[in-house]
Structures are given as structure tokens and as C-alpha cells.
């Protein structure tokens, strides 16, 4: 039975040209995390595998940095980076947990971080 929950940074905004940390946290389970995928709607950004370490998609190598922790840092943001991002936690024995973050990249300097929220 899957008892865990994923807490994410929720809806966030950042300035064009800046950077942002995408962060998820799995709680309320003793399941072992064996891999975390970071995905966009149509492509993989990065994988952190317990045995293999980090893999960053070549499309993002220049502006994606692994971490902190199991999170992902996006740099040199453009308006095209606006959209959904997903963290997928592969765990044993529970299975797969998914968290969603919506990032809005703003032209102006009024970017503010949204509230944190939980995805069961």
C-alpha cells in the first residue's frame, strides 16, 4: 500500500535569465527511493539513480544542474521554460510517486514564489 506523500515547491515563478530550484520531498513512507526522474510534458530533463548517479538530458546539459539533494536547478531561464515539471520517485516496495510543479517565467522583476502544497 502506498502511504507516502510528495511535497513540492508548488506553483512558482522566476525571472527570465535567472535560476530556480525544483524540489520535491517524499514523506510518510519508509520505502527506499531508488530513482528520481525530472520530466517535462514531453521530455526527460534528468534522472538521479541510486546506483548510476545523475543523468542530465543533452538538451539541458548547459543550463540544468543536479541538486540540491534530489532536486534540480534550472539556470538561464527563458519564457519557453514556463510550464509543468514532474518529479517521479521510484521506490521499493511502494512503487511510483509523482509530484507536479508549475513554473512561470516572468519578463519583469516581480516574480514571487508560490505557496507550498502537497500532492497525495
Amino acid at each position: 500500500m502506498m502511504t507516502g506523500t510528495i511535497e513540492t515547491t508548488g506553483n512558482i515563478s522566476a525571472e527570465k535569465g535567472g535560476s530556480i530550484i525544483l524540489q520535491c520531498h517524499l514523506s510518510s513512507t519508509t520505502a527506499q527511493v531508488t530513482q528520481v526522474n525530472w520530466e517535462q510534458q514531453d521530455q526527460l530533463l534528468a534522472i538521479c539513480n541510486a546506483d548510476l548517479g545523475w543523468h542530465i538530458s543533452p538538451s539541458f546539459k548547459d543550463r540544468v544542474a543536479p541538486g540540491p539533494g534530489l532536486g534540480l536547478t534550472l539556470q538561464s531561464l527563458t519564457v519557453n521554460d514556463t510550464g509543468e515539471y514532474f518529479c517521479i520517485y521510484h521506490t521499493y516496495p511502494d512503487g511510483t510517486y509523482t509530484g507536479r510543479i508549475f513554473l512561470e517565467v516572468l519578463e519583469s522583476s516581480v516574480a514571487e514564489h508560490g505557496a507550498r502544497f502537497q500532492i497525495p
Epitope: N37, E39, Q41, Q43, L44, I47, N49, H55, S57, T98
Partner: antibody, heavy 119, light 107 residues
């Protein structure tokens, strides 16, 4: 339980356009994070992904078929559709609808509908 | 597009034997490979995702391994109901692409 069911005309003539329907039960096609895809399987078993409509309504096509493909949906009926134009005999295949997860894998499939393009 | 190559169209085996099917990607796909089973007259069924993770309800005689470009799907002890065609799929990027399939049959 999630179920998908395809329907279509079966036989169409070359150069015509076909319209296939996928009816989904057990989940709304507007449920967050899922993509609703079309995949075809040629005689000889080769599988080809055609495209999807996302829960939000955005659509992505396989570039190799994009010029001939239209995917739409009817959310009140919980159906999505594939329209494929300028048909040739090479489009003869079984056409499947499937649910696609965030990981881009297909966890639920319909039983498929056979399309034969012949004069 | 990423090309997925299953070099064997057929694999002959005895019931109870171990059988391994290989799949090669044309570029590094990390661990983003899935495996499907298709029995005659049925639609494909998801067995493995992310190279080695069993989908819900899949028996533990089915395992997957590999990373980068080389992947293996193994049935540890083939049962009669496992006779089917098995496909790999990369779920790394768009367009999603499949291998040509490997049919597991009895000797």
C-alpha cells in the same frame, strides 16, 4: 477500472480521410497529468506512436505523420479522436488508443480497431 | 528519432527455462526503457518501465535491466502463458519509439 475502446469504419479507400473514436470509461480524460495517445501496429507487428492529446487539451504529433494527423476530443462524452487524411495502403494497420503517463509509457490500451485501406 | 533495435525476431525456449531478450537504443536513453507483452489477438501490456521497475501486478519472474544504450528483458522461468511478442520502448524523448518485437516460442 480504466477502459478504452476504439471504433472506426474498418475499410476505407485510398486518398480518403478516416475518423477513429476512442471512448474512455473509468477516468475522465481531463484528469491531471495523463496523455491520451494513438498508436498503430502494422502487419508484421511494427508499432508506431501517432500522437496524443494532453489532459489540458494541448496536442503533440509524431513529426512523421503531423501533416496528415488531427487529434481532437469531446470532453462531455469522454472521447478522443484520430483523423488521418490522404490514406494509402501503407496506412493499413491496427489502431490503438492508450493512456500515457508522465513517464511516457502506456499503461492502459484499447483492444484496437483494424483499418484497411484498399480500393 | 531514437531507434530501438531488437536483434532477435524469435527466441525459442523450453517451458521452465530462462530467456533473455535484448534491445539496443541508437543513443543514450539513461534508464528510460519500457517493455510490453503482446499475446495473439490482444493489445500490448506494460510489464516494465524505467528499465527495471515492474508495473503493478506483474509477476516477479519478469525482470528488466540496463542503462545507456543496452537493455535486457528476462523471464526467469518461462510459463505457457508467457508465449507472446515482447517489445521495448524508449520513454526518454518524443517521438516515443518501439523496438520491432521478439516472439518467444516453445522449441
Amino acid at each position: 477500472d480504466v477502459q478504452l475502446q476504439e471504433s472506426g469504419p474498418g475499410l476505407v479507400k485510398p486518398s480518403q480521410t478516416v475518423f477513429l473514436t476512442c471512448t474512455v470509461t473509468g477516468i475522465s480524460i481531463t484528469t491531471g497529468n495523463y496523455k491520451w495517445s494513438w498508436i498503430r501496429q502494422f502487419p508484421g507487428n511494427k508499432l508506431e506512436w501517432i500522437g496524443y492529446i494532453y489532459y489540458s487539451g494541448t496536442i503533440t504529433y509524431n513529426p512523421s505523420l503531423a501533416s496528415r494527423t488531427t487529434i481532437t476530443r469531446d470532453t462531455p462524452k469522454n472521447q478522443f479522436f484520430l483523423e488521418l487524411s490522404s490514406l494509402t495502403a501503407e496506412d493499413t494497420a491496427s489502431y490503438y488508443c492508450a493512456r500515457e503517463t508522465v513517464l511516457r509509457v502506456f499503461d492502459y490500451w484499447g483492444q484496437g480497431t483494424t483499418l484497411t485501406v484498399s480500393s | 528519432d531514437i531507434v530501438m533495435t531488437q536483434s532477435h525476431k524469435f527466441m525459442s525456449t523450453l517451458l521452465g527455462d530462462r530467456v533473455s531478450i535484448t534491445c539496443k537504443a541508437s543513443q543514450d536513453v539513461s534508464t528510460a526503457v519500457a517493455w510490453y507483452q503482446q499475446k495473439p489477438g490482444q493489445s500490448p501490456k506494460l510489464l516494465i518501465y524505467s528499465a527495471s521497475y515492474r508495473y503493478t501486478g506483474v509477476p516477479d519472474r519478469f525482470t528488466g535491466s540496463g542503462s545507456g544504450t543496452d537493455f535486457t528483458f528476462t523471464i526467469s522461468s518461462v510459463q505457457a502463458e508467457d508465449l507472446a511478442v515482447y517489445y521495448c520502448q524508449q520513454h526518454y524523448s518524443s517521438p516515443r519509439t518501439f523496438g520491432g518485437g521478439t516472439k518467444v516460442e516453445i522449441k
